[in-house]
């Protein structure tokens, strides 16, 4: 495992009187960003497979505005390196494509506009762990200067990042037959004995006794070429004899998405989110122009007519993605307010509002009690987005239409018995208690804890709660 690193040194007009003006203007300020795509470079098949080694996108560079009358200088660049991590062995020979993109920051309808300024490509031999290699390339009227290197991630070392280094077990020297790990002289090369019979061309190991396969090979000894035709199902055949890659425990293991696409698991398999310029189940289709009809779901394609010109899909409402291939789950943004139910009808969004709310997004709070009648003498109380009736005695329910059983809630305390009455309820209190709900104890000396009972009522008589 390791990282390919790309450093862009300059991007500007080539020499000579025909050099281009700046790609940015006072009217249209812009900024640059870069994309790198890496492929293993040995076989033609590998070279044709898009970005099989990985891809990366730089940050946006500083905003640049052309100074009228001044010659176009080298343009301001994004900070930092472009880094493409690789999981397996570094192939030694690789192909690259470096694209320079312009992001226009003028008053664009629908956000910034992107256009491809330049694309350079090449195939190079490069040993991991070596020094930075420099390059100068022309693309149209532009000149790009860059450096690149591949470096191993510890504990991997070596020109292909397949050897491992381990801390020394003894302070003075490495074990028998083992060399110090340059440049980490305080570490020793780990003894790596791959599984017996592991293909020296197509297999390697990072742990003794294992046999890991380079891309395009499978089987216990990496001797079986992968047959893509019988392996289209992400959980398809997995035996070595069928020549299919054995998938990991999850459908996104090993990232099946090419060209820097990102993988997300779905209930049945996986889904690739592709960068602009690529589409297909695994982002494997590239070199696309508007003539190829890359925009799905009625998206409008804008761009050049040849493979060197980028295209952009302007998606209709309800779709997104570089090729308008993804239906927007617009309800996930919870556009319906006040607890409204969201319905995505494809061509439009609908909100089904809760009582008391209205408007396209249920944003209007209605007068809850307007036009609402509470039956049987109940009174309407506003609040919480829905009307509520405060019912007269003996009635309940949302609109006070239901005759209530006043004794259902056992309102009489201390063993008092409840009697339903036309005007409410009456509690017959147990000896020693009094009050409308039998809530007060009667003192032994006959005095009540409360003011004297109303005339005509003796303690112990059923108290009527009016």
């Amino acid at each position: 495992a390791g990282v390919f690193e790309l450093q862009i040194h300059s991007f500007g007009p080539g020499p000579g009187p025909g050099a281009p003006r700046s790609p940015c203007s006072a009217r249209l300020p812009c900024r640059l960003f870069f994309r790198v795509c890496l492929k293993p470079g040995l076989s033609e098949e590998a070279a044709e497979s898009p970005c099989a080694l990985g891809a990366a996108l730089s940050a946006r560079g500083p905003v640049y505005t052309e100074q009228p009358g001044a010659p176009a200088p080298d343009l301001p660049l994004p900070d930092g390196l472009l880094q493409v991590p690789f999981r397996d062995a570094w192939p030694g020979t690789f192909s690259f494509i470096i694209e320079t993109w312009r992001e226009e920051l003028g008053d664009q309808i629908g956000g910034p506009a992107w256009s491809l300024l330049a694309r350079v490509a090449g195939r190079r031999r490069l040993a991991a762990g070596g020094p930075w290699a420099r390059d100068i390339q022309r693309a149209g009227a532009w000149e790009l200067r860059f450096s690149y290197r591949a470096r191993c991630e510890p504990p991997a070392v070596g020109t292909a990042c397949t050897r491992l280094c381990r801390p020394r077990s003894a302070p003075s020297r490495c074990g028998p037959g083992l060399r110090p790990c340059a440049p980490l002289e305080d570490e020793c090369e780990a003894p790596l004995v791959c599984r017996a019979g592991c293909s020296p061309e197509h297999g390697f190991c990072e742990q003794p006794g294992e046999c890991r396969c380079l891309e395009g090979w499978t089987g216990p000894l990496c001797t079986v070429p992968v047959s893509t035709s019988s392996c289209l199902s992400p959980r398809g055949p997995s035996s070595a004899t069928t020549g299919c890659l054995v998938p990991g425990p999850g459908p996104c293991d090993g990232n099946p998405c090419a060209n820097g696409g990102s993988c997300s698991e779905t209930p049945r398999s996986f889904e690739c989110t592709c960068p602009r310029g690529f589409y297909g189940l695994r982002c494997e289709v590239s070199g696309v122009t508007c003539a190829d009809g890359p925009c799905f779901n009625g998206g409008l394609c804008v761009g050049g007519a040849d493979p060197d010109s980028a295209y952009i899909c302007h998606c209709p409402p309800g779709f997104q993605g570089s090729n308008c291939e993804k239906r927007v789950d617009r309800c996930s943004l919870q556009p319906c307010r006040n607890g409204g139910l969201c319905l995505d009808l494809g061509h439009a969004l609908r909100c089904r509002c809760r009582a008391g709310f209205a408007g396209p997004r249920c944003e209007h709070d209605l007068d809850d009690c307007a036009g609402r009648a509470c039956a049987n003498g109940g009174t309407c109380v506003e609040g919480g987005g829905a009307h509520r009736c405060s019912c007269a005695l003996g009635f309940g329910g949302r609109d006070c239409r239901e005759r209530a059983d006043p004794c259902a809630a056992r309102p009489c305390a201390h063993g008092g018995r409840c009697y339903a009455h036309f005007s409410g309820l009456v509690c017959a209190c147990a000896p020693g208690y009094m009050g409308a709900r039998c809530e007060f104890p009667v003192h032994p000396d006959g005095a009540s804890a409360l003011p004297a009972a109303p005339p005509g009522l003796r303690p112990g008589d059923p108290q009527r709660y009016l």
């Epitope: 020499p15 033609e44 070279a47 044709e48 494509i97 694309r119 350079v120 490509a121 090449g122 195939r123 190079r124 031999r125 420099r134 390059d135 100068i136 390339q137 022309r138 693309a139 149209g140 000149e143 060197d308």
Partner: antibody, heavy 117, light 107 residues
Framework: QVQLQQSGAELAKPGASVKMSCKAS????????IHWIKQRPGQGLEWIGY????????EFNQNFKDKATLTADKSSTTASMQLSSLTSEDSAVYYC??????????WGQGTTLTVSS | DIQMTQSPASLAASVGETVAITCRAS??????LAWYQQKQGKSPQLLIY???SLEDGVPSRFSGSGSGTQYSLKINSMQPEDSATYFC?????????FGGGTKLEIK
């Protein structure tokens, strides 16, 4: 204007070595690489290698790895190529050219090497 | 190394005629193709780079096109001063390699 001025014709014996030069002017010498190209009489063109004057890094066509040595002197803005163990197969016109990896935009006038006993 | 096959090896054209020279690469070179003109006794001169970009100072009657493995150089309205040998060169891989050349003469 950009110019690459190459040294004069060379006559050498088989087994000997020869060193030819390429003086650059009219541009910043360290900004571009100097490539060397061989052309035998009535034949096509064959890339030998290049030197990056900034880093003095060199890269060669495998066919010339043991034949050519490339150097560059920033102070005199001059690139040089030494050819060793000469044989009659090395008789050719040798060009230096300014460029990057995918263009050679200015060429010297060429140095003719004749290897004869 | 990538092989470059140029055709025809030679041709003659009249003044004002349109001329086309083709170059085929042994594998995809991703537009990394340049065309050079070499007049008798002179050093080569860059005409076209990255398949279709015209070098500064080169007359607009010269144009380049192509993609993948097939590329061509076109001269619209041949002029006497266009008599020369034309070479294609791939720069996708190291070492860069040249075609065998096409000798263009005036009729």
């Amino acid at each position: 204007q950009v110019q690459l001025q190459q040294s004069g014709a060379e006559l050498a014996k088989p087994g000997a070595s020869v060193k030819m030069s390429c003086k650059a002017s009219g541009y910043t010498f360290t900004r571009y690489w100097i490539h060397w190209i061989k052309q035998r009489p009535g034949q096509g063109l064959e890339w030998i290698g290049y030197i990056n004057p900034t880093t003095v890094y060199t890269e060669f066509n495998q066919n010339f790895k043991d034949k050519a040595t490339l150097t560059a002197d920033k102070s005199s803005t001059t690139a040089s190529m030494q050819l060793s163990s000469l044989t009659s197969e090395d008789s050719a016109v040798y060009y230096c050219a300014r460029g990057g990896s995918n263009f050679f935009d200015y060429w010297g006038q060429g140095t003719t090497l004749t290897v004869s006993s | 190394d990538i092989q470059m096959t140029q055709s025809p090896a030679s041709l003659a054209a009249s003044v004002g005629e349109t001329v086309a020279i083709t170059c085929r690469a042994s594998e995809n070179i991703y537009y990394n193709l340049a065309w050079y003109q070499q007049k008798q006794g002179k050093s080569p001169q860059l005409l076209i780079y990255t398949a279709n970009s015209l070098e500064d100072g080169v007359p607009s009657r010269f144009s380049g096109s192509g993609s993948g493995t097939q590329y061509s150089l076109k001269i619209n309205s041949m002029q006497p001063e266009d008599s020369a040998t034309y070479f294609c060169k791939q720069a996708y891989d190291v070492p860069p390699t040249f075609g065998g050349g096409t000798k263009l003469e005036i009729k």
